[in-house]
Interface confidence: medium
């Protein structure tokens, strides 16, 4: 997290706000609900209280405007700048302005007013932008999904550094951004994508370019807004410029940023029995056109060319790949080796000699 220079903050805990005008995109009650919910994000974790005024001067004046709207920080039409807010202080201090050239919604369409407002009110309270891609105060808008919003830990640490903790946090689970060099790190899924490696963990993935050591961290939804926050397995089919992503009983086919029509599909359409609730890992072999799908202690082999599950499957993981354990969290193939991830450990398995040749920490893939 980052606070503003000179640690600008309010010297009182009871703050007022006023909604000066409304966007035509939403009903008045939807707008009021979004702002109330956005303030609650911050009051839940601090001693701050927010009271709405219907007229007069409030600490935080909220308005919608377009282009030049009276503060010499003009908006820019659709997309680009969405909103801005002033840090704590007199006059403009704390005020939040929203660009009415955007389409404001209470859903995933357009820009979600609650999410943008919660971010802007962070500025109104004294938080600058964060470098943590998982933080609400990260400067890039990402719709985080319909489920109950949880303020990330980075933002909690930031706001509490200014105002201290509240009496009781009604939602004490604050998601932490994974630390790639945590020795206990386990991974959810790994796939190549157009020459890069995507390493999934919780609602994030690291993107690793072959010539680089530093992996970039992204929210999965910043790449693919329609995907679930977390995924179970992934593999690339390079000759078709597709990747396949699995979550629960569903899977998606993606071409770059775009989901193919007709997806998601059910994993049972691949020929998996109905009892299989999820795929834990998947890896595709371009030379044979086969894909291994792991679930529980079993492995299936799918023929991607003929779109049929191979006979004699499922088989036990321990029988086909002795020594790697009875589950696979994530897997990928490179230069004749399969890399199996099981908890904080990865096994380098030689296809040619059919045995484990190295055991390494899982996060050595991230150069830790």
């Amino acid at each position: 997290y980052n606070v503003f220079p000179r640690t600008l903050k309010w010297s009182k805990m009871n703050l007022t706000y006023r909604i000066v005008n409304y966007t035509p995109d939403m009903t008045h009650s939807e707008v009021e609900k979004a702002f109330k919910k956005a303030f609650k994000v911050w009051s839940d974790v601090t001693p701050l209280n927010f009271t709405r005024l219907h007229d007069g001067i409030a600490d935080i004046m909220i308005s919608f405007g377009i282009k030049e709207h009276g503060d010499f920080y003009p908006f820019d039409g659709p997309s680009g700048l969405l909103a801005h807010a002033f840090p704590p202080g007199p006059n403009y201090g704390g005020d939040a302005h929203f660009d009415d050239d955007e389409t404001w919604t209470s859903s995933s369409k357009g820009y979600n007013l609650f999410l943008v407002a919660a971010h802007e009110f962070g500025h109104s309270l004294g938080l600058d932008h964060s470098k943590d891609p998982g933080a609400l105060m990260f400067p890039i808008y990402t719709y985080t999904g319909k489920s109950h919003f949880m303020l990330p830990d980075d933002d909690v640490q930031g706001i509490q550094s200014l105002y201290g903790p509240g009496d009781e946090d009604p939602n004490p689970k604050h998601p932490k951004t994974p630390d790639k060099c945590d020795p206990s790190l386990s991974l959810d899924a790994i796939t190549s994508l157009r020459g890069e490696t995507m390493i999934f963990k919780d609602r994030f993935f690291w993107r690793l370019h072959p010539q680089q050591v530093d992996a970039e961290l992204f929210l999965t939804k910043s790449f693919w807004p329609e995907l679930p926050n977390r995924i179970d397995a992934a593999y690339e089919h390079p000759s078709h410029d597709l990747i396949f992503i699995f979550r629960g009983r569903k899977f998606w086919a993606l071409n770059g940023y775009d989901i193919l029509e007709g997806y998601p599909k059910k994993i049972s359409e691949l020929g998996l029995p109905k009892e299989v609730k999820k795929i834990s890992a998947a890896v595709h072999f371009e030379d044979t056109g086969k894909t291994l799908l792991f679930s529980g202690n079993q492995v299936w082999r799918y023929d991607d060319t003929n779109h049929i599950m191979d006979k004699d499957y499922p088989r036990l993981i321990e029988e086909d790949f002795p020594g790697i354990g009875d589950k696979v969290d994530a897997v990928y193939e490179k230069n004749g080796y399969i890399y199996f991830f099981n908890g904080p450990i990865q096994f380098e398995y030689s296809i040619w000699s059919n045995r484990i040749v190295r055991v390494m920490p899982a996060n050595s893939i991230l150069w830790c």
Partner: nanobody, 114 residues
């Protein structure tokens, strides 16, 4: 319905630069990812670069660090700035909106030769 028209191709010497443009008709351009693909004679079409609705970029390994993709939604236009061009970059470059099942331009020829 989105129509795409590429421009900016031509003959350039190795080490030179070109900027391709992709002009889209229709106001929905900003709702689609924008991608550039290329096809060299006798070869398969291959992905070059992509930019998402949220302006996150993605490049083929062979062009990363040399090519830059960008978009200007207010002008309904996408761009591909190509620097340090090599003979192996010679191909017809196609603009795409919305991925493989989306919309395609007719292509513009880029020839890198001394």
């Amino acid at each position: 319905e989105v129509q795409l028209v590429e421009s900016g191709g031509g003959l350039v010497q190795p080490g030179g630069s070109l900027r391709l443009s992709c002009a889209a008709s229709g106001s929905t351009f900003s709702r689609y990812s924008m991608n550039w693909y290329r096809q060299a004679p006798g070869k398969q079409r291959e992905f070059v670069a992509g930019i998402s609705v949220g302006r996150i970029t993605n490049y083929a390994v062979s062009v990363k660090g040399r090519f830059t993709i960008s978009r200007d939604n207010s002008k309904n236009t996408g761009y591909l700035q190509m620097n340090s061009l090599r003979p192996e970059d010679t191909a017809v470059y196609y603009c795409n909106a919305g991925g493989l099942q989306g919309y395609w331009g007719q292509g513009t020829l880029v020839t890198v030769s001394s």
